[in-house]
């Protein structure tokens, strides 16, 4: 069975080329090894003066630490050095290279190829934890629609085998404190909080220990609150139409809705000479609407065949869900066979049938 | 609208490199990893490997640690796959797809790269 | 790797009818599975994920359950745009394997 990742591992005083920039380069080095990061200039031209930097803050020479313009050497390593170095132009700030370091407190021996997110004791790596995909730790706020599932990982490894546990904006966090529960997984060095809500907002710290030492890491996640809202339509739709007697129309609704939404195509009539009753409710007449076997896409489209004249008027697509109600209304034009088409006003078609 | 748009099909020789692209757009590019995704004729989908934008960092499917080399370009929010050394056995689509941030499945794909190795 | 064993390779199914897929894992995926729809010269489009979770936009006709090993997808009130390959995705680790596809045709 293949392994499935793959961590370049170092070994005494090796000089590791630069990566392209962009790239991040992880290396694995043995306590005690001498760590040697090399960055040619890109290119090959000038490179004009570098500053190398350690997480973040520039390294200062010493008898320990070496600093080139192109090369970086750190002696005697240990636990400590371990961390994300790169190499910047001073002026710009620009990362010209970038590596992610491991010490291990063994000397390094071999390929360190993790396959997934499980820790094994190898007997080689003993000492403290560290991250085995550090390429995934440094997205620090989530933010997630409420009732989605949400899972936060810290694969690590050490020697002895490290233990997880988490805490919520710094207390110890436990199944019991949320509703729905929690699903811990030591193995996958995952949280799991299925349906969250509002509540689960806040700060969640993995903390990554062994006897040799302990790390951790913090994600803040914010989740989402959908606005529940009524049904939008889509803007232009239903269209003014101009069409010929006895020709066919279409007349099309595009309804956007969380909610499962009800859509009715109706047309506006008149009664008694009047197009509105006593409290200016329009009159109209239901011409379409959900049945047993009627699909949503159905809906979304009135098909008038051989209009006459009598089908001329306003029609309106009416969209409705939990929260409300949205309407468009279009109007339809019949002109007699004989005569010529006229264009419709700007938003409108023409059909000849 | 979250778009990834990956460049044309190619056709290359046996032996030779390709490099395709996968331009994104709609979102914080270096907010999400890359995955890049195999389809063979007839075959599974297979990945092979993920980037991520921000750090530069990958993990590659050991199936394809030879073969593929990820990289991005955070200016332009584009993502790369090289390929090398190919042979008939290279010839698929390949997918990019971003990763969703908060559990891992793969939220939006482009629509492929058709690669044909031939001599 | 996790093995995802997708059934069946293809069907056939009548406008209107329901199909359901199935894909197991060779192993506890946690209900870290995800289904997809695949139509040619197009990108796969996401439509469920953590086994049942729909999509934002993907009707409620496309459905999903399962646990363990097990899951299934089902698509009820078959329209005729349904015509496309499905495929399961499993993300329970960081190794992610896909089941081998199911093409649906309409009768």
């Known amino acids: 069975e293949s392994l499935g990742t793959e961590q370049r591992v170092v070994g005494r005083a090796a000089e590791v080329p630069g990566p392209e920039p962009g790239q991040q380069e992880q290396l694995v080095f043995g306590s005690g090894d001498a760590v040697e990061l090399s960055c040619p200039p890109p290119g090959g031209g000038p490179m004009g003066p570098t500053v190398w930097v350690k997480d973040g803050t520039g390294l200062v020479p010493s008898e320990r630490v070496l600093v080139g313009p192109q090369r970086l050497q750190v002696l005697n390593a240990s636990h400590e050095d371990s961390g994300a170095y790169s190499c910047r132009q001073r002026l710009t700030q620009r990362v010209l290279c970038h590596f992610s370091v491991r010490v291990t407190d063994a000397p390094s021996s071999g390929d360190d190829e993790d396959g997934e997110d499980e820790a094994e004791d190898t007997g080689v790596d003993t000492g403290a934890p560290y991250w085995t995909r550090p390429e995934r730790m440094d997205k620090k706020l989530l933010a997630v629609p409420a009732a989605n599932t949400v899972r936060f990982r810290c694969p690590a490894a050490g020697n002895p085998t490290p233990s997880i546990s988490w805490l919520k904006n710094g207390r110890e966090f436990r199944g019991e404190h949320r509703i729905g529960g929690i699903k811990l997984r030591h193995q996958q060095w995952s949280l799991v909080m299925e349906s969250v809500v509002p509540s689960d907002r806040g700060n969640y710290t993995c903390v990554v220990e062994n006897k040799f030492g302990s790390i951790r890491q913090t994600y803040t996640l914010d989740v989402l609150e959908r606005s529940p809202h009524r049904p939008i339509l889509q803007a232009g739709l239903p269209a003014n139409q101009t069409a010929v007697l006895g020709s066919d129309v279409e007349f099309h609704c595009k309804v956007y809705s969380d909610a499962q939404p009800h859509i009715q195509w109706l047309k506006h009539v008149e009664v008694n000479g009047s197009k509105v009753g006593p409290d200016g409710t329009p009159y109209v007449t239901v011409l379409k609407t959900a049945g047993a076997n009627t699909t949503d896409k159905e809906l979304e489209v009135l098909s008038l065949h051989n209009v006459t004249f009598e089908d001329a008027g306003e029609y309106t697509c009416l969209a409705g869900n939990s929260i409300g109600f949205s309407h468009h209304s279009a109007w339809l034009v019949v002109l007699p066979a004989e005569e010529e088409l006229v264009e419709a006003d700007e938003a409108g078609s023409v059909y000849a049938g | 609208e979250v778009q990834l748009q990956q460049s044309g099909p190619e056709l290359v020789k046996p032996g030779a490199s390709v490099k395709m692209s996968c331009k994104a757009s709609?979102?914080?590019?270096?907010?999400?990893?890359m995955h890049w995704v195999k389809q063979s004729h007839g075959k599974s989908l297979q990945w092979i490997g993920y980037i991520n934008p921000n750090n530069g960092g990958t993990n590659y499917n050991q199936n394809f640690k030879d073969k593929a080399t990820l990289t991005v370009n955070k200016s332009s929010t584009t993502a790369y796959m090289e390929l090398r050394s190919l042979t008939s056995e290279d010839s698929a689509v390949y997918y990019c797809a971003r990763e969703r941030d908060y559990d891992g499945s793969m939220d939006f794909w482009g629509q492929g790269t058709s690669v044909t190795v031939s001599s | 790797d996790i093995q995802m064993t997708q059934s069946p390779s293809s069907l056939s199914a009548s406008l209107g009818g329901k199909v359901t897929i199935t894909c197991k894992a060779s192993q506890d995926i946690n209900k870290f599975i995800a289904w997809y729809q695949h139509k040619p010269g197009k990108g796969p489009r996401l439509l469920i994920h953590y086994t049942s979770t729909l999509q934002p936009g993907i009707p409620s006709r496309f459905s999903g359950s399962g646990s363990g090993r097990d899951y299934s997808f089902s698509i009820s009130n078959l329209e005729p745009e349904d015509i496309a390959t499905y495929f399961c995705?499993?993300?329970?680790?960081?190794?992610?394997?896909f089941g081998g596809g199911t093409k649906l045709e309409i009768k």
């Open positions: 995705l499993q993300y329970d680790n960081l190794l992610w394997t």
């Open positions: 709609g979102y914080t590019f270096t907010d999400y990893n």
